[in-house]
């Protein structure tokens, strides 16, 4: 366990990784390939009509810690799931939209009368 | 030091197969990609396809699709190259080389293989 | 393909003499999320295989004499011998890994006078 206020840098990989892409290919991915040196992620967020929408890619090492953390965002249905133990490991991260809380329907962007 | 130890040489018939071999040392087989060079005499350089030994997860370049598959002994720490249908188009010096960033920091000798009746 | 083109193919040289040689690609080799250049080069002497000089477009592998220098960015790339020695006759290479497949430029062969 890290002590308080002590930051270590991530580990870089002694070598790239390839993930599946799906919404979130970068400019140099192949047949919905992409390459890092940190990890593969999976996300199932709400778009703004409240449909799951899932996207796959490929994080770099640099604040992929913090992203893959899956802090929870107010008013913001999301979960993202990182993987790295193998080539397009993402593949098999099926993340869940975490369940709706009564305050999410009163404190959400629109208000039901 | 790291060495990528290949055979010389490869006399094969037109139209037969054969397994080329690259016996790695020197390193930890599984912390690198290995990749296949082709060079056809007084020729550049083209890339065939790699392999991750961790996983045995490969790509290929289009253009040697269903001529080349990659494979990997863990125990023996040897990446081999099978070619399939040779023809004379196929004589040329293989390399393996191995990657951790898709840049080809140790290179084998090179096998020269010839495709002769 | 990403198509690498390499001149002049060849050019002969004293040593002492300071040598360029060019290699420009059909589209970029910077990728966006890092500013790196997805570039390497490759010296091949007679009867040789190829050796790693110069990553990421600028970086020299570790063990390669500080007279080779790579630059350039985008889609032109050049690699510099400041003061060439009788040893460096060879061809020498291009590659581009920033998208699958790899492929590499035609080659300059230095001679030397």
């Known amino acids: 366990k890290k002590e308080d206020g002590e930051s270590t840098a991530p580990t870089p990989r002694p070598k790239v990784l390839r993930c599946k892409c799906h919404h979130h290919c970068p400019e140099d991915s192949v047949n919905n390939i992409c390459s890092t040196d940190g990890y593969c992620f999976t996300m199932i967020e709400e778009d703004d009509s409240g449909l799951p929408v899932v996207t796959s890619g490929c994080l770099g090492l640099e604040g992929s810690d913090f992203q893959c953390r899956d802090t929870p965002i107010p008013h913001q249905r999301r979960s993202i799931e990182c993987c790295t133990e193998r080539n397009e490991c993402n593949k098999d991260l099926h993340p869940t939209l975490p369940p709706l809380k009564n305050r999410d329907f009163v404190d959400g962007p629109i208000h039901h009368r | 030091q790291v060495q990528l130890q290949q055979p010389g040489a490869e006399l094969v018939m037109p139209g037969a197969s054969v397994k080329l071999s690259c016996k790695a040392s020197g390193y930890t087989l599984t912390n690198y990609w290995m990749h296949w060079v082709k060079q056809r005499p007084g020729q550049g350089l083209e890339w065939i396809g790699d392999?991750?030994?961790?996983?045995?997860?490969?790509n290929y370049n289009h253009k040697f699709k269903g001529k080349a598959t990659l494979t990997v002994d863990k125990s023996s720490s040897t990446a081999y190259m099978q070619l399939s249908s040779l023809t004379s188009e196929d004589s040329a010096v293989y390399y393996c080389?191995?990657?951790?960033?898709?840049?080809?920091?140790?290179w084998g000798q090179g096998t020269t293989l010839t495709v002769s009746s | 393909d990403i198509v690498m083109t390499q001149s002049p193919s060849s050019l002969a040289m004293s040593v002492g003499q300071k040598v360029t040689m060019s290699c420009k690609s059909s589209?970029?080799?910077?990728?966006?999320?890092?500013?790196?250049?997805?570039l390497a080069w490759y010296q091949q002497k007679p009867g040789q295989s190829p050796k790693l000089l110069v990553y990421?477009?600028?970086t020299r592998e570790s063990g390669v004499p500080d007279r080779f220098i790579g630059s350039g960015s985008g889609t032109d790339f050049t690699l510099t011998i400041s003061s060439v020695q009788a040893e460096d006759l060879a061809d020498y290479f291009c590659q581009q890994y920033y998208r699958i497949p790899w492929t590499f430029g035609g080659g300059t062969k230095l001679e030397i006078k």
């Open positions: 080389a191995r990657s951790g960033w898709d840049y080809f920091d140790s």
């Open positions: 392999i991750d030994p961790s996983d045995t997860y490969t």
């Open positions: 990421f477009a600028s």
């Open positions: 589209q970029s080799l910077l990728k966006s999320s890092n500013q790196k250049n997805y």
